[in-house]
Amino acid sequence: ARNGDRCPLGPGRCCRLHTVHASLEDLGWADWVLSPREVQVTMCIGACPSQFREANMHAQIKMNLHRLKPDTVPAPCCVPASYNPMVLIQKTDTGVSLQTYDDLLAKDCHCV
Amino acid sequence: ARNGDRCPLGPGRCCRLHTVHASLEDLGWADWVLSPREVQVTMCIGACPSQFREANMHAQIKMNLHRLKPDTVPAPCCVPASYNPMVLIQKTDTGVSLQTYDDLLAKDCHCV
């Protein structure tokens, strides 16, 4: 049975959503994005121990093979399971445009 | 411009599909799977340098913030972009069943 969201490494050390405050300069966007000026970037960070937030069968396989061949097969990795939408106002040749992104901010995380 | 599939670390070192030969025992399946006895497990392994097979805008952000705060933000990670289906013959209480898994074998890879 999966232990789901119980982190065996201690609170906050396993795969979870983190927020990183970033400016347009930090993101490398200053030359093409006008707004927003700063972004609360949500991303997935943390370890993926056995059975923790396994996304699918592939993640289970990967963990089993990692235990067997740690030098060959890496452990599963903490990545977004879904995303939150975001709007950017971008500079264009003719002025500005409103651009929507559905794959920019992580909403929740799992191990793959 | 993205360099897409050109690995700056040298051939075969960046995120790509690898095949690992595994037995049912390796996979921890020996007690519930009858067939196949061995599996050619395809999985995504390798480094994710800047602009290499970036899955989406989130991956670009993550790389930029990783460069800025390497101790806080990890580099993007090599994970399956899609999967190939696989059929297993499983043991059941009443005998055997044929089960298709759509999330078992990686088909191609990208960096997230």
Epitope: S35, R37, G95, T100 | -
Partner: antibody, heavy 118, light 107 residues
Framework: QVQLVQSGSELKKPGASVKVSCKAS????????INWVRQAPGQGLEWIGW????????KYNEKFKGRATLTVDTSASTAYMELSSLRSEDTAVYYC???????????WGQGTTVTVSS | EIVLTQSPATLSVSPGERATLSCRAS??????LHWYQQKPGQAPRLLIK???QSISGVPDRFSGSGSGTDFTLKISRVEAEDFGVYYC?????????FGGGTKVEIK
């Protein structure tokens, strides 16, 4: 805290122009975009346009293009909306709205009533 | 431009009841839909962003759902202070547009 304070009510004749001001306080003026929205009596909300205070780049609803002009005075932390060639249908409450995320309107001014009547 | 149609036009609810407000877009707008409350003589107030994300300071009895073209704002247990007009707004494309509003009356 973020505050947007708008200028007082205006009574104008058809064909005239009106200039509404929106003074910002409680934050760095160039950190938020300013949008202008109007509401005719008993009606819904209508977006007029957006301005980027840092360098005055603006975007207008096509319906108001050529009649509405959005400007900013960064030294006074104030945004302006000027509407020309006024007609009776322009009678409305005009709001400025500060937006941190350009998708929605977080902070609103109290509104300025503009009445167009001969 | 994207047209947002709100229903019903008026909703009469008793305190403690559940209220469900609808907003339909003329084309798919993903999650780019936001909800506001406006009381007489006041400016609108942001309640929900991006279809379902809560806003700090807004009571948790307000919740949003939906994506694509159909969106819902729910007030789980209506209170007397919840009267007013509720508007949806899309930010999928310029020009930003608002729905015609739903007036919530307290019975």
């Amino acid at each position: 805290q973020v505050q947007l304070v708008q200028s007082g009510s205006e009574l104008k004749k058809p064909g005239a122009s009106v200039k509404v001001s929106c003074k910002a306080s409680g934050y760095t003026f160039t950190s938020y975009d300013i949008n202008w929205v109007r509401q005719a009596p008993g009606q819904g909300l209508e977006w007029i346009g957006w301005i980027y205070p840092r360098d005055g780049i603006s975007k207008y609803n096509e319906k108001f293009k050529g009649r509405a002009t959005l400007t900013v005075d960064t030294s006074a932390s104030t945004a302006y909306m000027e509407l020309s060639s006024l007609r009776s249908e322009d009678t409305a409450v005009y709001y400025c709205a500060g937006t941190y995320d350009p998708a929605y309107f977080d902070y609103w001014g109290q509104g300025t009533t503009v009445t167009v009547s001969s | 431009e994207i047209v947002l149609t709100q229903s019903p036009a008026t909703l009469s609810v008793s305190p403690g009841e559940r209220a469900t407000l609808s907003c339909r877009a003329s084309q798919s707008i993903s999650y780019y839909l936001h909800w506001y409350q406006q009381k007489p003589g006041q400016a609108p107030r942001l309640l929900i962003k991006y279809a379902s994300q809560s806003i700090s300071g807004v009571p948790d009895r307000f919740s949003g759902s939906g994506s694509g073209t159909d969106f819902t704002l729910k007030i789980s247990r209506v209170e007397a202070e919840d009267f007013g007009v509720y508007y949806c707004q899309q930010s999928n494309s310029w020009p930003y547009t608002f729905g015609g509003g739903t007036k919530v009356e307290i019975k």
